[in-house]
Interface confidence: low
């Protein structure tokens, strides 16, 4: 008779992003055996949660429960039921409830509250409900993609398992871009830091990190965005805004209550003598770049070096993995490729803004149209933060890696998150301490 | 030029209540975080507590918490604060002060009230 | 309540440095933002901001007035002193709502 191989012990976590825009579901799998191993987590599955941000349910809390029930009965039906009640359940909710929490801690608490006690009902081992910093969303991130790289393995392999991976053991930095904040984070050259705020020191498998961190809060791309428009507003000579970074044709009527509903706009509110005003594309990106510009101030720098708004920012160093929107956008523009180089995405953005309204349309005619409307501003607001906001340059854009998914497993914070707290990132290179929570906070 | 006029200075007994205004010219006060300071004579400034004129949110200084209300009207662009049951260490010259959000730049001051509470 | 502790006095001669020092009992870092903003009052005026965010110089101040520090350590430099800056100084933090210093009197010998 054939030799049967023994059934591999295999678990499972699950961790939810409860971003601005939207909630995603994770569903982790490794072998039990194997799990302080570097490289072995992989995910399996994600579920995106239909409707917007958990920021958004403030005033309808009650509606919180279903919101969440098709995917986490999706974890149910991917996850064996004689695993569930071991499998741990981490929500993470990132920039948009910041902000709901500088408008409001109570708020953002009942909010929290509700999400808690819908997850609690489940089979699974829920760890609780948190609002991360942005500083561990950096961390994380880095973790994250330096882990399914495997940069923090010591054998080092003769083939290489991705396109990006190098036999050198230099981790990437890693620049995250979401609705309501964007971090960057990596390895600077000079391990001395001006800022301790933004200085990370960790140990994983047996080595000495020294990262640096900076997460920016409303500027994400859709916070952004709502900035820009404050700006541009109280220039505009009546209700109609003209917005270079539109496309020409494109019109569109937004409320001033909505505009200044975010904290992220309450620098530029002002009195209007309307309670409506109507944006009309132009599709211009050099005045778009112009425009989105504005929102970085860079006249002000108490360090050798600084990002914007007085953000200390080490020089830029190694290869850098740019995921979630800097992917997504950048993917549906088609600008991801390793051979396009700065001025050739410049000049296709170009293009792109100031194609007519009615011809994208047609092009993409499957994209929901709030979405479309968008990639000319998030492309552009894309290539000024990363040349003007993080002084990356003709010469060092071939260095960002546009990255969506990296061995099946999408990049971002989630990963990272859970590997540490379910202490599957040793501090040493054999089995040996794991790396505390209390490292990020 | 945004401007925060305060109304005049009150004399009041002990256990009465004074009401305060502010009023702001030049934007409106549901671009801001309305605060009030108080300072008594001689002494340090001491925050009172905050309201949000957009959202009719309040946050008080737990000292005050059972004695201070704070209210505003945005159709005169004008907040308020009530502080009952006087006594003599209550008083100070009180001062509104706007914040665009937590944190960032303290626009503006008014002038400030004297309130004398005295048998 | 994030109790802020300052020293208490200074005299300093004009054209010296004064440095005034607060501490606050917890971070008033936030999102990598640090919520400490200083003020200038003069007898019978309400304060005046100097700096807010930890160093960042509010409009109108010269540039003799500079601010530095992150998590609990603050100062307030004047460099150099002018006789007009007698006066008393206060650190506010508005990380967790508001609270300031005693307040440091500035004294010009």
């Known amino acids: 008779t054939q030799n049967k191989a023994l059934p591999e012990n295999i678990k499972y976590g699950i961790v939810l992003d409860a971003g601005s825009s939207h909630t995603s579901l994770y569903i982790y799998k490794w072998p039990a055996e194997k799990e302080n191993d570097t490289g072995v987590v992989h995910q399996v599955e994600e579920c995106r949660v239909k409707g917007p941000g958990i920021s958004k349910y403030v005033q309808k809390v009650n509606e919180i429960g279903i919101y969440l029930t098709d995917c986490m009965e999706r974890a149910r039906e991917v996850i064996p039921r004689s695993q569930h009640q071991e499998t741990p359940v981490y929500l993470g909710a990132t920039a948009g409830m910041r902000l709901l929490r500088m408008e409001s801690e109570e708020l953002a608490d009942r909010v929290l509250d509700v999400v808690e006690r819908s997850l609690s009902n489940y089979p699974f081992d829920f760890q609780g409900a948190r609002i991360i910093t942005g500083q561990e969303e950096g961390a994380y991130g880095w973790i994250t993609i330096n882990y399914l790289l495997g940069k923090f393995s010591q054998k080092t392999r003769w083939f290489s398992i991705v396109p990006y991976e190098t036999n050198n053991q230099e981790t990437f930095g890693a620049l995250d871009l979401g609705g309501a904040s964007t971090q960057i984070t990596f390895v600077p050259q000079n391990q001395t830091t001006e800022s301790p705020d933004n200085a990370l020191q960790f140990r994983l498998y047996g080595k000495d990190y020294n990262v640096y961190t900076h997460s920016f809060l409303c500027y994400g791309k859709d916070q952004a965005l709502w900035q820009k428009l404050a700006k541009d507003i109280q220039v505009a000579s009546n209700e109609i805004l003209r917005d270079p970074c539109f496309h020409p044709g494109y019109k569109k009527v937004v409320n001033v209550s909505d505009l200044y509903k975010t904290p992220c706009t309450k620098r530029f509110e002002m009195t209007l003598p309307f309670q409506q005003f109507e944006i009309q594309g132009i599709g211009n990106y050099q005045q778009c770049h112009q425009s989105v510009l504005e929102l970085f101030n860079t006249s002000y720098c108490p360090y050798s070096q600084c990002a914007f708004n007085g953000i200390f920012l080490p020089p830029l160093q190694g290869d850098f993995g740019a995921f979630s929107a800097f992917y997504f956008v950048m993917n549906f523009l088609n600008l991801t490729s390793e051979k396009v180089s700065q001025e050739k995405v410049t000049e296709m953005m170009k293009k792109f803004c100031s194609q007519p309204w009615e011809e994208i349309k047609t092009s993409y005619a499957g994209v929901k149209e709030k979405y479309l409307s968008e990639y000319c501003f998030s492309g552009t607001y894309i290539l000024s933060l990363l040349l003007q906001g993080y002084h990356f340059t003709a010469d060092s854009w071939e260095h960002i890696h546009f990255i969506g998914k990296i061995q099946g497993s999408d990049a971002g914070w989630t990963l990272g998150y859970m590997l540490n707290l379910t202490n599957m990132i040793p501090a040493e290179q054999p089995l040996s301490t794991p790396l505390s929570h209390s490292t990020y906070v | 030029q945004v401007q925060l006029v305060q109304s005049g200075a009150e004399v009041k007994k002990p256990g009465a209540s004074v009401k305060v205004s502010c009023k702001v010219s030049g934007d409106s006060i549901t671009a801001y975080f309305m605060h009030w300071v108080r300072q008594a004579p001689g002494k340090g400034l001491e925050w009172m507590g905050r309201?949000?004129?957009?959202?009719?949110?309040?946050k008080y200084a737990e000292k005050f918490k059972n004695r201070v209300t704070m209210t505003s009207d945005t159709s005169t662009n004008t907040v308020y604060m009530e502080l009952s049951s006087l006594r003599s260490e209550d008083t100070a010259v009180y001062y509104c002060a706007t914040e665009r959000v937590p944190g960032f730049e303290t626009d503006y001051w008014g002038q400030g009230t004297m309130v004398t509470v005295s048998s | 309540d994030i109790v802020l502790t300052q020293s208490p006095a200074l005299a300093v001669s004009p054209g010296q440095r004064a440095t005034i020092t607060c501490r606050t009992q917890q971070t008033v870092d936030h999102y990598g933002t640090t919520y400490m903003n200083w003020y200038q009052q003069k007898p019978g005026q309400p304060p005046k901001l100097l700096i807010y965010l930890a160093s960042s110089l509010a409009s109108g101040v010269p540039a003799r007035f500079s601010g530095s520090g992150s998590g609990t350590d603050f100062t307030l430099t004047i460099n150099p002193v002018e006789a007009d800056d007698t006066a008393n100084y206060y650190c506010?933090?508005?990380?967790?709502?508001?609270?300031f210093g005693g307040g440091t009197k500035v004294e010009i010998k």
């Open positions: 309201i949000d004129p957009d959202h009719e949110r309040t």
């Open positions: 506010q933090q508005s990380r967790n709502l508001w609270t």
